[in-house]
Interface confidence: medium
Amino acid sequence: VPRWRQQWSGPGTTKRFPETVLARCVKYTEIHPEMRHVDCQSVWDAFKGAFISKHPCNITEEDYQPLMKLGTQTVPCNKILLWSRIKDLAHQFTQVQRDMFTLEDTLLGYLADDLTWCGEFNTSKINYQSCPDWRKDCSNNPVSVFWKTVSRRFAEAACDVVHVMLNGSRSKIFDKNSTFGSVEVHNLQPEKVQTLEAWVIHGGREDSRDLCQDPTIKELESIISKRNIQFSCKNIYRPDKFLQCVKNPEDSSCTSEI
């Protein structure tokens, strides 16, 4: 008789989740010599141990500590790029500007990017049918707690100038409820970080508005200034040209406003 299973509102664990995590770990450690010492089987065991046999609405940051320890990684603290609601462009940027890093360019971020996972209380099974939705079910679910934990640690490590890419096409360019707005902003360390520099990415080709004057950007500046951190904002009017100029900074068209 099939056992009754909790139905959650969100999609279930990504198919072939264990294999995907393990394969990503192996690939990452091969590409990044500084992480070659990492034992990917131990990483998977620690990852699994964070959520297997636990109620998927009762996950804590402590559950992920063994994984955090194994995935400890030093990135240049003054080369951190945060992003909110504009992941693809942020990743395209760091693929070109190889000395800058998003969270997903680190081992732990790379392992979990775009994946979903959860288990069930008191069984060693992975739930491939459904997982808790952050809004409809609970916030302390395995995926949300993971990203909150790694995002906090990533922000805490930042120093000097921290960049954040924001989506100028959204109604809330800065959203207090995003991971950036609820976790990363509040975990930048004022004694290490001098300036948060926001890059507001424009969507429309003919959009010449100064989105740095947007009320939500002013709200971000207010939060940042109260944390003793300077704030700077730049409009990126042409994201396609912006990327092109990162690739070819000597191009004559790259001296003008982008």
């Epitope: 004694e191 001098q194 300036t195």
Partner: antibody, heavy 117, light 110 residues
């Protein structure tokens, strides 16, 4: 070090461009470079800053419109002043805030602007 | 812009004495405040940053403190070389506050 230049005797309603030149470091690194002025026998007055990383330019509310701060090269930042009046007569300093809240601890010696007919 | 009200405008004290200068911010600027010393014909010299941190090379006779929106610079064991004008500055340059200076305090050493 920082050195200001461009100070001069100008007539009222005239314009002037002051230049701040860095030596020993460059503005390719992200710094806050600020202009501050001091009228003879008076106190210090903050005018504007430029963040050399993004080009962000906060101004004192009284300075908006007549003053324009720009990064013109990897070693120069300028301050353009228009519609000059006698009240703009002052020594103009440029200064660098170099690190995490360590205050503006690198100053030029200043350049004198005199506005008189 | 934030308004920085500095008091007194002038203060006189004997060598070996103590001087206290206050700076009141019109709004909460956290610890985003610096103190400078300026002598005639010279640019300002940084003494204190982040309200209470001593700048490198500055004597420990200079002490900065904060209570809410009121900031204090205390100079103890006064020396003749301390005769100068002292300024406070809000060191947040963004549009929230602006890098406003206080009006200055002249310190005369007798």
């Amino acid at each position: 070090s920082l050195e200001e230049s461009g100070g001069d005797l100008v007539k009222p309603a005239g314009s002037l461009t002051l230049t701040c030149t860095a030596s020993g470091f460059s503005f390719s690194t992200s710094y806050w470079i600020c202009w501050v002025r001091q009228a003879p026998g008076k106190g210090l007055e903050w005018i504007a800053c430029i963040y050399t990383g993004s080009g962000s330019t906060p101004y004192a509310s009284w300075a908006k419109g007549r003053f324009t701060i720009s990064k013109t090269s990897s070693t120069t930042v300028t301050l353009q002043v228009t519609s000059l009046t006698a009240a703009d007569t002052a020594t103009y300093f440029c200064a660098r805030d170099p690190g995490v809240h360590s205050g503006t601890n690198l100053w030029g010696q200043g350049t004198l602007v005199s506005v008189s007919s | 812009d934030v308004v920085m009200t500095q008091t007194p405008a002038s203060v006189s004290a004997a060598v070996g004495g103590t001087v206290t200068i206050k700076c009141q911010a019109s709004e909460d600027i956290n610890t985003l405040l610096a103190w400078y010393q300026q002598k005639p014909g010279q640019p300002p010299k940084l003494l204190i940053y982040l309200a209470s941190n001593l700048a490198s090379g500055v004597s420990s006779r200079f002490k900065g403190s904060r209570s809410g929106t009121e900031f204090t610079l205390t100079i103890s064991d006064l020396e003749c070389a301390d005769a100068a004008t002292y300024y406070c500055q809000c060191t947040y340059y963004g549009s929230t506050y602006g890098g406003t200076f206080g009006g200055g305090t002249e310190v005369v050493v007798k």
